[in-house]
């Protein structure tokens, strides 16, 4: 026998209290698939998060980060502070890359300059905190 709830589309829930009729999701909630017996609470983009896409009755809100921060984790579950190029984020804040390392992005860690001699090459352009070395012939 077919479950009557399977007829309830996204944006509704199957109301067991009312002979399994399809009732619309309450405001600030959604159901992204049919046949659900409850709706899900919409994500709230607050604080350092900002709304990239509003919640609808059929899809959750999507958040990104305010300027000066970038997303981390699935679905932007966290916001991490940006640093300048040539820096990395530590527990004490943004710190310049140590000599011999670089970071060409606003996120991530400082990485060692390429060792040109490993490939039998010489340094064509010296590295900086922001840029890797350029190896020559």
């Amino acid at each position: 026998l077919q479950d009557p709830c399977s007829n309830c589309p996204a944006g509704t829930f199957c109301d067991n209290n009312r002979n399994q009729i399809c009732s619309p999701c309450p405001p600030n909630s959604f159901s992204s698939a049919g046949g659900q017996r409850t709706c899900d609470i919409c994500r709230q983009c607050k604080g350092v998060f900002r709304t990239r896409k509003e919640c609808s009755s059929t899809s959750n809100a999507e958040c990104d980060c305010t300027p000066g921060f970038h997303c981390l984790g699935a679905g932007c579950s966290m916001c991490e502070q940006d640093c300048k190029q040539g820096q990395e984020l530590t527990k004490k804040g943004c710190k310049d890359c140590c000599f011999g390392t670089f970071n060409d992005q606003k996120r991530g860690i400082c990485r060692p300059w390429t060792n040109c001699s490993l490939d039998g090459k010489s340094v064509l352009v010296n590295g900086t905190k922001e840029r890797d070395v350029v190896c020559g012939p």
Epitope: S23, P26, N28, R37, T38, C39, I41, C42
Partner: nanobody, 122 residues
Framework: EVQLLESGGGLVQPGGSLRLSCAAS????????VGWVRQAPGKGLEWVSA????????YYAESVKGRFTISRDNAKNTLYLQMSSLRAEDTAVYYC???????????????WGQGTLVTVSS
């Protein structure tokens, strides 16, 4: 026992106004997320307006924004819906409803009253 009793419906001409009331007993309106749903003839339920503590906001359906105003009187444990500039498409049975948050994050709503019929016609 939880009860919600809607009143204030009736026949009104297009452009007219009505105020619906919902008197609650068995629970405290001010401690709940509550609102109004309606069912037009031959149609499904539609959320009209709600006061949402979870979202920290007042919700209005696009079709009623700027025309309907939801409010509550905590002392009287009563919810109101002030409706103005009424249109034929607002004709429906209006029910007072309570949003229910379930363990595990699910959301549904309850409504118990018989509703109050609003007919907009000339």
């Amino acid at each position: 026992e939880v009860q919600l009793l809607e009143s204030g419906g009736g026949l009104v001409q297009p452009g007219g106004s009505l105020r619906l009331s919902c008197a609650a007993s068995g629970f405290t309106l001010s401690a709940e997320d509550v609102g109004w749903v309606r069912q037009a003839p031959g149609k499904g339920l539609e959320w009209v307006s709600a006061i949402l503590d979870f979202g920290g906001s007042t919700y209005y359906a696009e079709s009623v924004k700027g025309r309907f105003t939801i409010s509550r009187d905590n002392a009287k444990n009563t919810l109101y819906l002030q409706m103005s500039s009424l249109r034929a498409e607002d004709t429906a049975v209006y029910y007072c409803a309570r949003v229910v948050y379930h363990a595990g994050g699910g959301v549904t709503f309850d409504y118990w009253g018989q509703g109050t019929l609003v007919t907009v016609s000339s």
